[in-house]
């Protein structure tokens, strides 16, 4: 069969080769493959200014294989498509286009957004958060004793991060002021901070609320940290007025 095809081609192409290479059924020196062996795909390959026929077992990027009875070829994907399954179903779009249901689009349809990483149109994903966790214990400077007013915090987790066009996440941290029943700190609760404060002046900006007022000292044993002269207490009151208590919410 191949021989007879070769003879015929010689009439149209004086340079038909006797032995075709690379899956060609018929070929010529000038045009390369003219036809292919069964199951192979004919394709045009550009070599310099010239296009020659080649026979391939699979088609190159930008082409898909079309099979007709006893004749197969590589057929170009649409102009905006890089890789396709067939003429009407693209699997990867060229730069600047977004893939949606096998088509390449300039812009994604309503209700979808462009994913610039995958270059696909994807559903808009809104933020989802869990229920709030319980409030934390009321604390002041990390301590749960030795003060009247402090702050408590609660948190919730992000279950689903939003996509670019999705609704932003609501705050995941919430802080509020709280009041506790005054209780004295036990020995073990004071820690290193307390022992250091005995030997040095208090830090600037330290809140008055961290220590009980003078009335409370009457009903409780004095402990070293609470011994302050009146001058120091006056100084602390001025500092407290200058420092306003702010509660921030983290997004």
């Amino acid at each position: 069969q191949n021989a007879s095809r070769g003879r015929r081609q010689r009439r149209m192409h004086p340079n038909v080769s006797q032995g075709c290479q690379g899956g060609c059924a018929t070929c010529s020196d000038y045009n390369g493959c003219l036809s292919c062996k069964p199951r192979l795909f004919f394709a045009l390959e550009r070599i310099g200014m010239k296009q020659i026929g080649v026979c391939l077992s699979s088609c190159p990027s930008g082409y898909y294989g079309t099979r007709y009875p006893d004749i197969n070829k590589c057929t170009k994907c649409k102009a905006d498509c890089d890789t396709c399954f067939n003429k009407n179903f693209c699997t990867k779009c060229k730069s600047g286009f977004y893939l949606h249901l096998g088509k390449c689009l300039d812009n994604c349809p309503e209700g979808l957004e462009a994913n610039n990483h995958t270059m696909e149109c994807v559903s808009i994903v809104h933020c989802e958060v869990s229920e709030w966790n319980p409030w934390s214990p009321c604390t002041k400077k990390g301590k749960t004793c030795g003060f009247k007013r402090g702050t408590e915090t609660r948190v919730r987790e992000i279950i689903q991060h939003p996509s670019a066009k999705g609704n932003l996440c609501p705050p995941t941290n919430e802080t509020r002021k709280c009041t506790v029943q005054r209780k004295k700190c036990q020995k073990g609760e004071r820690g290193k901070k307390g022992r250091e404060r005995k030997r040095k002046k208090p830090n600037k900006g330290e809140s008055k609320e961290a220590i009980p007022d003078s009335k409370s000292l009457e009903s409780s044993k004095e402990i070293p940290e609470q011994r302050e002269n009146k001058q120091q207490q006056k100084k602390r009151k001025v500092q407290d007025k200058q420092k306003s208590v702010s509660v921030s919410t983290v997004h």
């Epitope: 069969q1 003219l34 036809s35 004919f42 045009l44 026929g53 006893d70 004749i71």
Partner: antibody
Framework: EVQLVESGPGLVKPSETLSLTCTVS????????WNWIRQPPGKGLEWIGY???????YQNPSLKSRVTISRDTSKNQFSLKLSSVTAADTAVYYC?????????????WGQGTLVTVSS | DIQMTQSPSSLSASVGDRVTITCKAS??????LSWFQQKPGKAPKTLIY???RLVDGVPSRFSGSGSGTDYTLTISSLQPEDFATYYC?????????FGQGTKVEIK
């Protein structure tokens, strides 16, 4: 030189089946692709379908339900049957061949035969 | 199916003129295009295949060019025997479709 000659009745009644044969010389129909093409009077060319070197066929979807292409390798002939004809099927019918995507398409043609559909 | 739009449908020219006929495909046909010449009462004759390859025996005054969807047949210097109807054919996929033809007449 490859030669193709069409033969068959020149007149067919409406609703009947048109039957044509193409006899090939100078080559074997067990290689290449053997086609039927038609041309209504004063109009353009329309491709009907082909039969391949192995006997597989492919028809133009616009005519597929009415077209049958077959062959007789012992006589080196291939045939066209077009059923349920109407006046719109009046045309010159050509057989032609090609050998693959890299060579000339329809390098060889028959001389054509006019088929008129009329009662 | 791929549609082939050929233009002009007819043209008048003189011997020695340069004639250009165009064929536009409804989608990229990747150079799988042939040109045919047909004279009255005769079968078409293949002139060019794969856009620009001349069939053996066809005069070099005939040339083809183009890519994508737009293709051209040029006759550089029209000869008396060139007055005929010209058709383009795409064979990028099946079904194959021809252009509607361009009749080249004597001016």
């Amino acid at each position: 030189e490859v030669q193709l000659v069409e033969s068959g009745p020149g007149l067919v009644k409406p609703s009947e089946t048109l039957s044509l044969t193409c006899t090939v010389s100078g080559d074997s129909i067990t290689s290449g692709y053997w086609n039927w093409i038609r041309q209504p009077p004063g109009k353009g060319l329309e491709w009907i379908g082909y039969i391949s070197y192995s006997g597989k066929t492919y028809q133009n979807p616009s005519l597929k339900s009415r077209v049958t292409i077959s062959r007789d390798t012992s006589k080196n002939q291939f045939s066209l049957k077009l059923s349920s004809v109407t006046a719109a099927d009046t045309a010159v019918y050509y057989c032609a061949t090609y050998y693959g995507y890299g060579g000339p398409w329809f390098a060889y043609w028959g001389q054509g035969t006019l088929v008129t559909v009329s009662s | 199916d791929i549609q082939m739009t050929q233009s002009p449908s007819s043209l008048s020219a003189s011997v020695g003129d340069r004639v250009t006929i165009t064929c536009k495909a409804s989608q990229d046909i990747d150079s799988y295009l042939s040109w045919f010449q047909q004279k009255p009462g005769k079968a078409p004759k293949t002139l060019i295949y794969l856009t620009n390859r001349l069939v053996d025996g066809v005069p070099s005054r005939f040339s083809g060019s183009g890519s994508g969807t737009d293709y051209t047949l040029t006759i550089s210097s029209l000869q008396p025997e060139d007055f005929a109807t010209y058709y383009c054919l795409h064979y990028d996929e099946f079904p194959l479709t021809f252009g509607q033809g361009t009749k080249v007449e004597i001016k």
